[in-house]
Interface confidence: low
């Protein structure tokens, strides 16, 4: 703020992202025929009026008038952080300080610890790490659109003594719905200005099969051809399908992949049919009641999980 001393220069603190450009602006109301000067934290003069004093091509003159001296520093490095001084050589010399804070941009996070082919109900533990942030960034986890609660972000100083490496772990019990899900670790930091910087890990979950019997056509009549499709789901996908008819000698022959075919439907085909879908994760038997006397088959609500 402008003080009562019209010859007192003023400036402002600035925050810049590493690699970015910062503009340092110094103003004075009454210059008393003196020039303004900018110097760096090492007390090296950068500009005296419109005259360049330091050979650094990153530092450029923006504006030089009797009442203002503005310079820009491009490709700012962490080492550029500190107090910059604007001076006016009146009697006495008056100065104003600008604290330049350089933000370290966090690197893209790295996810480690994923063990392939997790089984349903097992616990997945993933670790996430990001280096280079200043101040220390925060890490968050999500699974799809759902937030995951990881442990508190751990902070470790990088070897340069200026930036930080942050890390976080998350553990959760996987379900079959998680098969193919993306676990995302995002880094949150003011240098990113809301931009997303994240890494995702797609997980595979092995789970026991399920099956469903689907008739084709949906409403077969006596004399028609009928296909009973056994549609297996699971990871891995069931590779073996066995058909049985209650009261008959098992198993029945399949004639088309996992389907049971009736070339010419008759009343003796009535009964309850079971299809057992098997993978190396287990088996599941679905049942279907076929009543040829009726105009359409009635699916049974019962199914058995082995």
């Amino acid at each position: 703020n402008l003080s009562q001393d019209d010859s007192q220069p003023w400036t402002s603190d600035e925050t810049v992202v590493a690699g970015g450009t910062v503009v340092l602006k110094c103003q004075v109301k009454d210059h008393e025929d003196s020039s303004l000067q900018w110097s760096n934290p090492a007390q090296q003069t950068l500009y005296f009026g419109e005259k360049r004093a330091l050979r650094d091509n990153r530092i450029q003159l923006v504006s030089s008038t009797p009442h203002e001296l503005s310079i820009s520093i491009s490709n700012v490095a962490l080492a550029d952080e500190g107090e910059y001084t604007c001076s006016i050589f009146t009697m006495p010399v008056r100065t104003a300080k600008s604290l330049v804070t350089v933000l370290g941009i966090p690197q893209k996070p790295i996810i480690t610890g994923y063990k392939s082919s997790l089984r349903e109900k097992e616990t997945a533990t993933l670790n996430c790490q990001s280096s280079g942030s200043k101040p220390a960034a925060q890490l968050t986890w999500r699974k799809g659109d759902q937030e995951l609660h990881g442990d508190q972000t751990r902070i470790q100083e990088d070897p340069n003594g200026k930036t930080f490496t942050v890390s976080s772990s998350v553990s959760f019990q996987v379900t079959r719905e998680d098969d193919g899900a993306n676990i995302v670790c995002s880094v949150n930091h003011e240098s990113l200005k809301g931009a997303d910087r994240s890494t995702s890990q797609r997980i595979e979950v092995l789970y026991t099969p399920t099956a469903m019997i689907r008739p084709e056509p949906a409403h077969p009549r006596e004399g028609q051809k009928l296909l009973l499709h056994c549609e297996g789901r699971g990871n891995p996908v069931p590779q073996q399908y066995v058909w049985v008819k209650e009261g008959s000698e098992p198993p029945l022959k399949m004639t088309q992949e996992s389907a049971l075919i009736f070339p010419f439907l008759n009343k003796s085909d009535s009964g309850t049919y079971g299809c057992t879908a098997t993978s190396n994760m287990g088996s599941y038997t679905a049942y279907f009641t076929l009543n040829v006397n009726d105009p359409s088959p009635v699916p049974s609500s019962s199914s058995t999980y082995h």
């Epitope: 089984r119 109900k121 098997t278 190396n280 287990g282």
Partner: nanobody, 124 residues
Framework: QVQLVESGGGLVQPGGSLRLSCAAS????????RGWFRQAPGKEREFVAA????????NYADSAKGRFTISRDNAKNTVYLQMNSLKPGDTAVYYC?????????????????WGQGTQVTVSS
Amino acid sequence: QVQLVESGGGLVQPGGSLRLSCAASGRTFSNYARGWFRQAPGKEREFVAAIDYSGGSTNYADSAKGRFTISRDNAKNTVYLQMNSLKPGDTAVYYCAAPASRRPSWDADGYDYWGQGTQVTVSS
């Protein structure tokens, strides 16, 4: 050293029941599947039942369905085979087996560690 120790076998009358136990030592088996197999004199070893690491998935041979139940107690590192309505055809040496991976398997090739077996005799 991995060890699987079966117990609970014996002589039982037809229609009777037995409960076999398989205790594991030398390694934590709670995260792994376990299986029961049997071998009758002069016959090949055959699959009886298997259970996954959590107990959520089980599988049975046709000869065991409805009569035998496999279960596990991970706190005790033990798997059980409850055998009801026993028949003379169930007479065999019963073996407990564990795979070296978490993947369950329903045939003998999928198992790496075997117990010494326990004799089950069903006779009147």
